[in-house]
């Protein structure tokens, strides 16, 4: 993630800024969506609770060849403390429910906006 420290004292992005940037990216995706996002690919739905950043990444990482969500995947990896690879699943997945990537992004965006409003950045 980008470094927003002063020239003399570079440091990591504050969590609020990182969350803001992730929200901005998801907004860009929803705004710029012409054709079905990622050709209508389906991903596992997730529970939007603690640990949901890793769960979201685990779902989206299984979508390949979709440039529209590559930046989101990279940003989510900055929120997830462990390495995530395709085929990995956590208990946060609603394993019997698949939804389109576009709906997944929409649900995630709404939840992140509420977290931002509540000051929950980590």
């Amino acid at each position: 993630l980008t470094c927003l420290g002063g020239f003399a004292s570079p440091g990591p992005v504050p969590p609020s800024t990182a969350l803001r940037e992730l929200i901005e990216e998801l907004v860009n995706i929803t705004q710029n969506q012409k054709a079905p996002l990622c050709n209508g690919s389906m991903v596992w739905s997730i529970n939007l609770t603690a640990g949901m950043y890793c769960a979201a990444l685990e779902s989206l990482i299984n979508v390949s060849g979709c440039s529209a969500i590559e930046k989101t995947q990279r940003m989510l990896s900055g929120f997830c403390p462990h390495k995530v690879s395709a085929g990995q699943f956590s208990s946060l997945h609603v394993r019997d429910t698949k939804i389109e990537v576009a709906q997944f992004v929409k649900d995630l965006l709404l939840h992140l906006k509420k977290l931002f409003r509540e000051g929950q950045f980590n």
């Epitope: 609020s16 803001r20 929200i23 901005e24 907004v27 929803t30 705004q31 939007l48 929409k106 965006l109 709404l110 939840h111 906006k113 509420k114 931002f116 409003r117 000051g119 950045f121």
Partner: antibody, heavy 125, light 112 residues
């Protein structure tokens, strides 16, 4: 169009409870916070609490904690405010209001942009 | 709890003249996310309140540009550049930055 329609006026005895409903239309309540605000006769506005209908998380003003319960039913797009152990000082108009979150701005206004018409609750022996 | 103090409590204004309402918070109301959730609402006689201004200075859709908000930290102002007869009512400031969220006591604007 967006509407919040509240239940009708109530007359209650001291010590009893009241449950006011707020039926939403024209939007999904899971995309919002739903708030409750009250106004005693001739007095100002008092925020009581809020709910995130997507997960049921609530925030209450400490003075109402334990007496107020805010709930929401996504299936009927309705928010509820229940106030128990009523006393005469609870006589007021109770309003519901929403704060909406949309897909098209990174930072929504979050403020209470639509309000119900108000429900008068009279507490009298 | 954060106390929001408005002044004046009563504001008689001649139509066409400007009006200004002050709102002071008992402590800084910058939210942890960097925003300041300071809002202004107008309640006309017999009606529900309606949103005028959010985040200090952003006008809500449909609100005339005669209304403007300013301020920072603990001091905020609502200005009406030219008051019209339709502007009568009670104006409330509100902070939504720190729970419990709180309203000011209201300023009653009346036409002279």
């Amino acid at each position: 169009q967006v509407q919040l329609v509240q239940s009708g006026a109530e007359v209650k005895k001291p010590g009893s409870s009241v449950k006011v409903s707020c039926k939403a239309s024209g939007f999904y309540i899971k995309d919002t916070y739903m708030h409750w605000v009250r106004q005693a006769p001739g007095q100002g506005l008092e925020w009581m609490g809020t709910i995130d209908p997507a997960n049921g998380n609530t925030k209450y003003v400490p003075k109402f904690q334990g007496r107020v319960t805010i709930t929401a039913d996504e299936s009927t797009s309705t928010a509820y405010m229940e106030l128990s152990s009523l006393r005469s000082e609870d006589t007021a108009v109770y309003y519901c209001a929403r704060s909406i979150y949309d897909d098209y701005h990174w930072d929504d206004y979050y403020a209470m942009d639509y309000w119900g018409q108000g429900t008068l609750v009279t507490v009298s022996s | 709890d954060i106390v929001m103090t408005q002044s004046p409590l009563s504001l008689p204004v001649t139509p066409g003249e400007p009006a200004s309402i002050s709102c002071r918070s008992s402590q800084n109301i910058v939210h942890i996310n960097g925003n300041t959730y300071l809002e202004w609402y107008l309640q006309k006689p017999g009606q529900s309140p309606r949103l005028l201004i959010y985040k200090i200075s952003d006008r809500f859709s449909g609100v005339p540009d005669r209304f403007s908000g300013s301020g920072s930290g603990t001091d905020f102002t609502l200005k009406i550049s030219r008051v019209e007869a339709d502007d009568v009512g009670i104006y409330y400031c509100f902070q939504g930055s720190h729970v419990p969220w709180t309203f000011g006591q209201g300023t009653k604007l009346e036409i002279k």
